[in-house]
Structures are given as structure tokens and as C-alpha cells.
């Protein structure tokens, strides 16, 4: 298992919500990405391929997510101060083998300016 801080901008704020960017290498074809808040699994997305190179995307813990060829974005809405925490992208790589797990993360700071519908 490889652990480390994300070496890219992991949190992108917009409209009172946050997009949490979880990157993976372009070469990865089949994987599971979990978003952890502290030690708790908030969201997950699994991409696998069939014999005809068809793709299956599944989630056991569903969040609004977006998949690209090198990242999974998870979206959290209605931010409040309770969202401040360490968030981790837990990537399990199935293909190419051998199986490996990488964990990258960072701390989500919540500032008044990023909250939804603040009172003026």
C-alpha cells in the first residue's frame, strides 16, 4: 500500500459544494476508487471491463461522481463546518496487475466564503 499527500489540487469549491478529485494513472483499466472521510467510506466507484471491452461502472456507496480517463471526481454538497476533515482517495488497481492499493489525501478546510447560503 502506497500512502501520500495528493500532489495536485484535490478540492475544488463551487456553489456551496466541493468537488474532490481522485486521480489515477492513465494505464489503469480496472479499479475501485473509494473516498474516505477519516476512516469512513463515503463513496466508491468500481470500473471493470467485459470480454468485448465493454465497461461496467458500479457503486456500493453512491455519491454524485464523474469518471474521466485518469480521475474520479466525487461531489459533496451543502457544505458546513462538519465537512472539515481529512479526505483520502483509496485506489485499488486490478488491471494492470499485480493488485495494489494507493492512498492519497489532504485536509479539507472550510471557510465561511465556501459555505452555501451564508447569512449576510
Amino acid at each position: 500500500e502506497i500512502n501520500g499527500s495528493a500532489n495536485y489540487e484535490m478540492f475544488i469549491f463551487h456553489n456551496g459544494g466541493v468537488q474532490i478529485l481522485c486521480k489515477y494513472p492513465d494505464i489503469v483499466q480496472q479499479f475501485k476508487m473509494q473516498l474516505l472521510k477519516g476512516g469512513q467510506i463515503l463513496c466508491d466507484l468500481t470500473k471493470t471491463k467485459g470480454s468485448g471491452n465493454t465497461v461496467s461502472i458500479k457503486s456500493l456507496k453512491f455519491c454524485h461522481s464523474q469518471l474521466s480517463n485518469n480521475s474520479v471526481s466525487f461531489f459533496l454538497y451543502n457544505l458546513d463546518h462538519s465537512h472539515a476533515n481529512y479526505y483520502f482517495c483509496n485506489l485499488s488497481i486490478f488491471d494492470p496487475p499485480p493488485f495494489k492499493v494507493t492512498l492519497t489525501g489532504g485536509y479539507l478546510h472550510i471557510y465561511e466564503s465556501q459555505l452555501c447560503c451564508q447569512l449576510k
Epitope: Q30, K32, T48, G50, S51, G52, N53, T54, S56, K58, S92, F94, D95, P96, P97, F99
Partner: antibody, heavy 120, light 106 residues
Framework: EVQLVESGGGLVKPGGSLRLSCAAS????????MHWVRQAPGKGLEWVGV??????????YYSDLVKGRFTISRDDSKNTLYLQMNSLKTEDTAVYYC????????????WGQGTLVTVS | DIQMTQSPSSLSASVGDRVTITCQAS??????LSWYQQKPGKAPKLLIY???LLAEGVPSRFSGSGSGTDFTFTISSLQPEDIATYYC????????FGPGTKVDIK
């Protein structure tokens, strides 16, 4: 212990039909892609076709040599794979193996001992 | 369809010899190549997958290398129990086997 046991082989006339079965045990059958591979007497291995898992809507793919004549199906509740062979030709004479493969999260590959089909 | 070729079709070597078999794909298959061993009257056995990864329980004298279209399978020190036919198989797009290489002892 993993076991794949093929049955249903035998002697059949050209133009006839035969249904092979493959009973699986010792692994989670429903998670595996199931293939048929054949080997004519004294010859090399030849892929016949595959049926994917439920995640991929049980999609089937066939080699050009058998397309339109052979049909692969599976019954996950019975841990059984089938090969329906119609319009049989003398060149279909072979030992037929069922094989189970999976790549997620680890790569595994299991083979049965084969069943002989003679078209004569 | 992806075609696989293998050479040589057969070879004889002495116990302890280094044995090398080559396999070529008709198009780029990345590293999606397996090697199988088949002994007479038996089902094939997976030795190597994803070009160079040893299957469970396979001795380390077996190895594989290559990428794209050209691949090599090596037995570093041939043992009597290695007498068999060896097949490469691509699994980049469905499955295709090479024609096989029969290995025996001099």
C-alpha cells in the same frame, strides 16, 4: 477445492446437435467469465467463445468458426455452464474444455479436464 | 481477429539448459499475454499472465518478457517435468492461442 467438470460429449453425426455442460464448484461461479476452448486430436488449443457475468448482461462472444452454430449460456443458481452445438461438422471433433477466468481483484484461471466430442 | 504465431514449433534440449520460446501477435496487445503448459492427456495449466507475472505455485525458473507484439517465454534451467507443449495466448481482445511449442529432452 476448485473443480470444473464437463459432461455431455459423445459421438454425433454431421449436422447433428449436442449440449455440453460444465459443473463448477469451489469458487464464486457468478463472478467469473466462462469460456469454452477446444482441442482437435493432436492439434493445438482453439478458443470457442465466452459468456460474461451478470454485470455485463451475460454478453456472449464467439470465434468465427462456430458463430451462428454454437450458443453459450450459464445458470448461476446451478453453478453450471452450457454449450449448445448445432449443425455439427467433422472439424468440430475435439476435446472441449470449460475454463473460468477473473481479473478483479486478482487474476485466476481454472480449467476442467475436458469432454470429447466426435462428429462422424 | 488477432493472430498469434509461435516459434519454434518444437525443440529438444538437455536437462539444465536454458530454453526460449517466442510469440508474436498480429497487432499490439499491450501486455495481455499468458503462457500455458500442457502435458499429454491433461488440461492446460496457466504459468504466466500479463506477460511476466507468475501464476500461483509456478516455479521461478519460468519467466516471460515483452510488450506490444513480441514476447518471449524462458525456462532458465530445463527439468524433466517440463516436458510438455507450451502455448501463448492473447487476452487483449477475446482469446487467441498460438500454435504451440513442443519441448522434449535430448
Amino acid at each position: 477445492e476448485v473443480q470444473l467438470v464437463e459432461s455431455g460429449g459423445g459421438l454425433v453425426k454431421p449436422g447433428g446437435s449436442l449440449r455440453l455442460s460444465c459443473a463448477a464448484s469451489g469458487f464464486t461461479f457468478s463472478d467469473y467469465f466462462m469460456h469454452w476452448v477446444r482441442q482437435a486430436p493432436g492439434k493445438g488449443l482453439e478458443w470457442v467463445g465466452v459468456i460474461d457475468t451478470k454485470s455485463f448482461n451475460y454478453a456472449t462472444y464467439y470465434s468465427d468458426l462456430v458463430k451462428g452454430r454454437f450458443t453459450i449460456s450459464r445458470d448461476d443458481s446451478k453453478n453450471t455452464l452450457y454449450l449448445q452445438m448445432n449443425s455439427l461438422k467433422t472439424e468440430d471433433t475435439a476435446v472441449y474444455y470449460c475454463t473460468a477466468t477473473i481479473a478483479v481483484p486478482y487474476y485466476f484461471d481454472y480449467w476442467g479436464q475436458g469432454t470429447l466430442v466426435t462428429v462422424s | 481477429d488477432i493472430q498469434m504465431t509461435q516459434s519454434p514449433s518444437s525443440l529438444s534440449a538437455s536437462v539444465g539448459d536454458r530454453v526460449t520460446i517466442t510469440c508474436q501477435a498480429s497487432q499490439d496487445i499491450s501486455n495481455y499475454l499468458s503462457w500455458y503448459q500442457q502435458k499429454p492427456g491433461k488440461a492446460p495449466k496457466l504459468l504466466i499472465y500479463y506477460t511476466n507475472l507468475l501464476a500461483e505455485g509456478v516455479p521461478s525458473r519460468f519467466s516471460g518478457s515483452g510488450s506490444g507484439t513480441d514476447f518471449t517465454f524462458t525456462i532458465s534451467s530445463l527439468q524433466p517435468e517440463d516436458i510438455a507443449t507450451y502455448y501463448c495466448q492473447q487476452y487483449y481482445n477475446y482469446r487467441t492461442f498460438g500454435p504451440g511449442t513442443k519441448v522434449d529432452i535430448k
